[in-house]
């Protein structure tokens, strides 16, 4: 598709005569008829196969033609065509005299013709005008002509359609030959593919507009070359997406188990020494005078009940002092001045004389002790409960209240967290101080092996044409994410897109 343009420049008819030699009255009011047709060695009358056009009256006798609209006509004259330009043509230009206002052929007498010229030849498409001048005995016509392509048509024959665009379907302008020239930042056959930020990781990154670098799931950073740790990860990093590699001092699947509780929490009080003893556990070694799990309790010298025979204990700066009841003396009121005659045995204890009545001994009933049966038996003094269990006096006996995870009369047995078979899908259970841990068989993960994970379906690199491979965890199969221009389950088929 294109346009044959004819620019009339000057017409000379000094004598103001018709082709017949007869003069025009009062002068030759001149207009032109142009006929464009296929190449003919000898130009003959017949249909104007490439088009025709007429002008209004442009002047009288001799005149120059302006380069614009003249009296409603256009200069240059436009002869559009909607076919491939063949490169050759025939052109007939007739000058006519218009006695009245009606310029239709049927309204004019045949002898109103002033002159007729016919040319033929080759003409390539181009912007340059070809200047020509045709002279007869009485007239002269100077004109120029060219063939140019219509908007959006390019090439030697105006046969290549190319419409510049900057939208989802392409980002390009058109070269003179009709080839696409991508706008900056775009590439591909139809300039639909953005050129990502320089250095953007080929597999982990992509872009939807030029100089962008967007990361695929699991990757981060300007160039998408840094991984993102697992959602549940607390104190860890990664070297591949969704990993959780623990920072120093942390353990467990999500690095949430504190292996360095002493440093992170300083639980031991009053200058005690802290020792890490596994995940989230520790032991405090108390300084003299302190007790408790965290050495938070101050010891009293009287706490050990050193005074015998009902003596009362008083704390002092440098220790303690026993105030003895009547009939007793000594540092701990351990010596008696009494005999059985003084009924020294309390709580139903029976008295036995010793050393010919110089001293005595009390035989105490159950639940009582002391040289005078004055003390109720505390069966917890020996700290019989293991693993931090709490000792409780229960009449003639004692019992241990165990911490979670322990059992037995003296809390001496660790309750196995594995007893209830918590690991799913054939996972192996391990008892740890902090709880249990499951070792999962291939294809499963999670704290209890409850998450089905894929055997890497992408390991065999099944995707073609640099497609990205993902594993479908629900079916253990691969999914190929095709780059632009390819389709198929393995991105194996190229897509042939027509020009849009």
């Amino acid at each position: 598709s294109g346009v044959f343009q004819l620019q009339l420049q000057e017409f000379v008819n000094e004598r103001g005569v018709l082709a017949s030699g007869r003069p025009c009255e009062p002068g030759c009011r001149t207009f032109f008829r142009v006929c464009l047709k296929h190449f003919q060695a000898v130009v003959s009358p017949g249909p104007c196969t490439f088009g025709s056009v007429s002008t209004p009256v442009l002047g009288t006798n001799s005149f120059a033609v302006r380069d614009d609209s003249s009296g409603g006509g256009r200069n240059p004259l436009q002869l559009p065509f909607n076919f491939t330009w063949p490169g050759t043509f025939s052109l007939i230009i007739e000058a006519w005299h218009a006695p009245g206002d009606d310029l239709r052929p049927e309204a004019l007498p045949p002898d109103a013709l002033i002159s007729k010229i016919a040319i033929q030849g080759s003409l390539a498409v181009g912007q340059n005008w070809l200047l020509d001048e045709q002279t007869s005995t009485l007239t002269r016509l100077r004109y120029s002509y060219r063939v140019i392509c219509s908007d959006n048509y390019y090439g030697d024959n105006c046969s290549r359609l190319c419409k510049k665009r900057n939208d989802h379907f392409g980002h390009y302008v058109c070269q003179p030959d009709g080839n696409l020239s991508c706008l900056p930042g775009w590439t591909g056959e139809y300039c639909q593919q953005p050129i990502c930020l320089s250095g953007c990781h080929e597999q982990n990154g992509y872009c939807s507009k030029p100089a962008e670098c967007l990361c695929r799931p699991g990757w981060q950073g300007r160039l998408c070359n840094e991984c993102i740790p697992h959602n549940g990860c607390r104190h860890g990093t990664c070297s591949t997406p969704w990993q959780c590699t623990c920072d120093e001092g942390w353990g467990g699947l999500f690095c949430d188990q504190d292996l360095n509780y002493c440093t992170h929490h300083s639980p031991c009080k009053n200058g005690a020494t802290c020792s890490n003893s596994g995940q989230r556990s520790y032991t405090c070694t108390c300084r003299p005078g302190y007790t408790g799990v965290d050495c938070e309790l101050e010891l009293s010298e009287c706490d050990s009940n050193p005074c015998r025979n009902g003596g009362s204990c008083k704390d002092q700066e440098d220790g303690y002092h026993c105030l003895c009841p009547p009939g007793y003396y000594g540092l701990h009121c351990e010596h008696s001045t009494l005999s059985c005659a003084d009924s020294p045995c309390f709580n139903g204890g029976s008295c036995r004389e010793r050393n010919q009545g110089a001293s005595y001994a009390c035989e105490c009933p159950p639940n009582f002790t002391g040289s005078n049966c004055e003390k109720k038996v505390d069966r917890c003094t020996s700290n019989p409960c293991a693993n931090g269990g709490q000792c409780l006096n229960r009449g003639p006996s004692r019992m241990c209240r165990c911490r979670p995870g322990f059992t037995g009369t003296y809390c001496e047995r660790h309750v196995s967290d594995c007893a209830r078979n918590p690991c799913a899908h054939g996972g192996t259970c391990h008892d740890l101080e902090s709880g249990l841990m499951c070792t999962c068989p291939a294809g499963f993960s999670g704290r209890r092996c409850e998450v089905r994970t894929s055997i890497d379906a992408c390991a065999s690199s099944p995707c073609f044409n640099r497609a990205t491979c993902y594993t479908d965890l629900s079916t253990d199969t691969f999914v190929c994410n095709c780059p632009y221009g390819f389709v198929g389950s393995r991105c194996e088929f190229p897509v042939g897109l027509p020009p849009s």
Epitope: P217, G218, Q220, G221, R222, I228, R234, H235, G236, Y470
Partner: antibody, heavy 118, light 107 residues
Framework: EVQLVESGGGLVQPGRSMKLSCAAS????????MAWVRQAPTRGLEWVAT????????YYRDSVKGRFTISRDNAKSTLYLQVNSLRSEDTATYYC???????????WGQGTLVTVSS | DIQMTQSPASLSASLGETVTIECRAS??????LAWYQQKPGNSPQLLIF???NLADGVPSRFSGSGSGTQSSLKINSLQSEDVASYFC?????????FGGGTKLELK
């Protein structure tokens, strides 16, 4: 226990600025990308901005680009959102969250309400 | 941007019932989908990621499934503490986008 505590919200006039903060604890802050997500009754949940942990690369939703700035201080385990040229459509509860634009938002703060009104 | 369409917008169910919430993406999101639960007056909490993986501490009565553009969240044996709004979110394409939410109430 992971904790994210937002602050800095309140009533502000259109065109004005404010700075939201989010104090993080219970995880190693410097290791994780962070994000702001907002929730308005009319528009539901909307991702607002993201910052990577590795190099501090930032991303924003189109409607806030050039007005909002996300930043982080790893030494203080704190995430920030500087909001400028506020509009009535920015009225929402702003949540601080651990996550990127291409990962789930694993943990969320309790939110801070920003009301833009004259 | 990828559009996420959740259905239904609200639903009522009885205790012990099984409930299913659907989420449709405007294009393939390759299983990069999460579900969140938001109880009244609280912030959202991650329930499920990568379409079918349960987040830490989430009860096993919750499950997720789907592929391509269709995903669903299933709650078996509904409990009173499950009364909340539920949101889906895709993180396959930039920017991440959320569904409009489903409000779950007790009958």
């Amino acid at each position: 226990e992971v904790q994210l505590v937002e602050s800095g919200g309140g009533l502000v006039q259109p065109g004005r600025s404010m700075k939201l903060s989010c104090a993080a604890s219970g995880f190693t802050f410097r290791n994780f990308p962070m994000a702001w997500v907002r929730q308005a009754p009319t528009r539901g949940l909307e991702w607002v901005a993201t910052i990577s942990s590795s190099d501090g690369t930032t991303y924003y939703r189109d409607s806030v680009k050039g007005r909002f700035t996300i930043s982080r201080d790893n030494a203080k385990s704190t995430l920030y959102l500087q909001v400028n040229s506020l509009r009535s459509e920015d009225t929402a509860t702003y949540y601080c969250s651990r996550g990127y634009y291409n990962s789930p938002f694993a943990y969320w703060g309790q939110g801070t309400l920003v009301t833009v009104s004259s | 941007d990828i559009q996420m369409t959740q259905s239904p917008a609200s639903l009522s169910a009885s205790l012990g019932e099984t409930v299913t919430i659907e989420c449709r993406a405007s294009e393939d999101i390759y299983s990069n989908l999460a579900w969140y639960q938001q109880k009244p007056g609280n912030s959202p909490q991650l329930l499920i990621f990568d379409t079918n993986n349960l987040a830490d501490g989430v009860p096993s009565r919750f499950s997720g499934s789907g592929s391509g553009t269709q995903s669903s969240l299933k709650i078996n044996s509904l409990q009173s503490e499950d009364v909340a709004s539920y949101f889906c979110q895709q993180y396959n394409n930039y920017p991440p986008t959320f569904g409009g939410g489903t409000k779950l109430e007790l009958k």
